[in-house]
């Protein structure tokens, strides 16, 4: 006889990285017929929602209107059908960004490289932090972690065209409080080329926010829940 229900999915919209003072919604998706959802923060009960009518709703949302460092941390959710509770969801690490300072991101040998060359990113922040995070924009938000007194190095090995994309870095004051994002660096990877000995023109980056790569729609989210959980856990453990 089943003692618990399957665990729900948990994710953050638009993203698990939330600029301070901005809003975020924590979503918990269980089963139709669930009469109660509980959101836990750092192991303690944080909020409760009772959907109406339960048989027509399989997802609830917990709204945080004003993100700050106190709200950053690990969230999980559970739901109840009748008297039967579910397993807890995976942990969602909610991160507050835009804290304190802005790092600078540089890439060696440069932003335009040839397939097969080894590339290293350098993230620098002069204030008190020793952990740095490098993110490649995109659906899966690839994250690398690095350490150093004022800067960290992120070697990328021999690059392929799969490494093309826009990168940003953060300084991390703790696991859940990150700096402002650096300006973006757009890495262009070409195949072997005959002649580019003169310096390439300065790369130009749109002055848009780094939110362009955050998921803002539910389309495709269902299949990405596990990916978000996995990404966040790998990053923050």
């Amino acid at each position: 006889q089943q003692q618990t229900l399957p665990k729900p999915f948990i994710w953050a919209e638009p993203h698990f990285m939330v600029p301070k003072e901005k809003q975020v919604t924590i979503c918990c998706q269980g089963n139709y017929g669930a009469v109660e959802y509980q959101l836990h923060f750092e192991g303690s009960l944080f909020a409760v929602d009772r959907p109406k009518p339960p048989e027509r709703i399989n997802k609830v949302q917990f709204y945080i209107p004003d993100m700050n460092s106190r709200m950053a941390g690990q969230y999980s959710c559970i739901y109840r059908v009748g008297e039967l509770w579910s397993e807890p969801s995976n942990l969602l690490d909610l991160v507050v960004t835009e804290m304190y300072d802005t790092p600078t991101l540089s890439v060696h040998p440069g932003p335009e490289v040839i397939s097969g060359e080894k590339v290293t990113f350098y993230c620098r922040l002069d204030t008190a932090t020793s952990m740095f995070l490098l993110l490649k924009e995109g659906r899966s938000s690839h994250v690398q972690r690095g350490y150093g007194k004022v800067q960290a190095e992120f070697p990328l090995g021999p690059v392929t065209t799969a490494h093309r994309g826009t990168y940003r870095c953060f300084g991390s004051y703790n696991n859940h409080a990150w700096s402002f994002p650096s300006e973006p660096v757009k890495l262009l990877v070409t195949g072997d080329i005959e002649n580019t000995s003169l310096a390439p023109e300065d790369p130009t980056f749109p002055a848009d926010t780094w939110g362009t790569y955050l998921l803002t729609t539910e389309t495709g989210l269902q299949k990405d829940h596990a990916l978000w959980d996995h990404t966040a856990q790998n990053l923050l453990r």
Epitope: T104, G110, I114, E117, T120, R124, Q151, D192
Partner: antibody, heavy 115, light 107 residues
Amino acid sequence: QVQLQQPGAELVKPGASVKLSCKASGYTFTSYWMHWVKQRPGQGLEWIGMIHPNSGSTNYNEKFKSKATLTVDKSSSTAYMQLSSLTSEDSAVYYCVYDGRFAYWGQGTLVTVSA
Amino acid sequence: DIQMTQSPSSLSASLGERVSLTCRASQDIGSSLNWLQQEPDGTIKRLIYATSSLDSGVPKRFSGSRSGSDYSLTISSLESEDFVDYYCLQYASSPFTFGSGTKLEIK
């Protein structure tokens, strides 16, 4: 076109310090790495370190960490390398080199350490 | 640190001859290798970058190639101005390191 201007020579006393300059023109100074390379008379080349003028990021060869300090002045598009506690082992030609792939080389500054 | 073993240390050859210089990397450097030319007055010029890409203004008689961890600079037909010093340089991983150099002399 790209130009890197370095003084031809510097004569310094043992134990003293010297600050070598490298004035860049012909490209956007803040966009590309600047390297420094040492060559002792009749010897090969040794990489000292590099600096990114925009971010201030530096990377030093461990061997030169206590010897060399790299800085830049963005307003004058000039890179500097300060060498401290000089000995005869520091007598060499020092090249500044711009671009991550070492594309353009200055003419070098001959540093002579002598009493 | 990555060691770059350059050979030969000196090479005597005749005008019009084809010669190859080699550098062996002690660790994987991908295609992050340059070939540099140094004149007797100390002037240094990059000839090849990223293993095989020819710099602007460099004569087509110069070419670069790779076989595993061995990187080669080939001069297809030597001219008088080619009899100078050559160095390889890996820029894959810091500290970036140079080969010990090859002195190309006229026979």
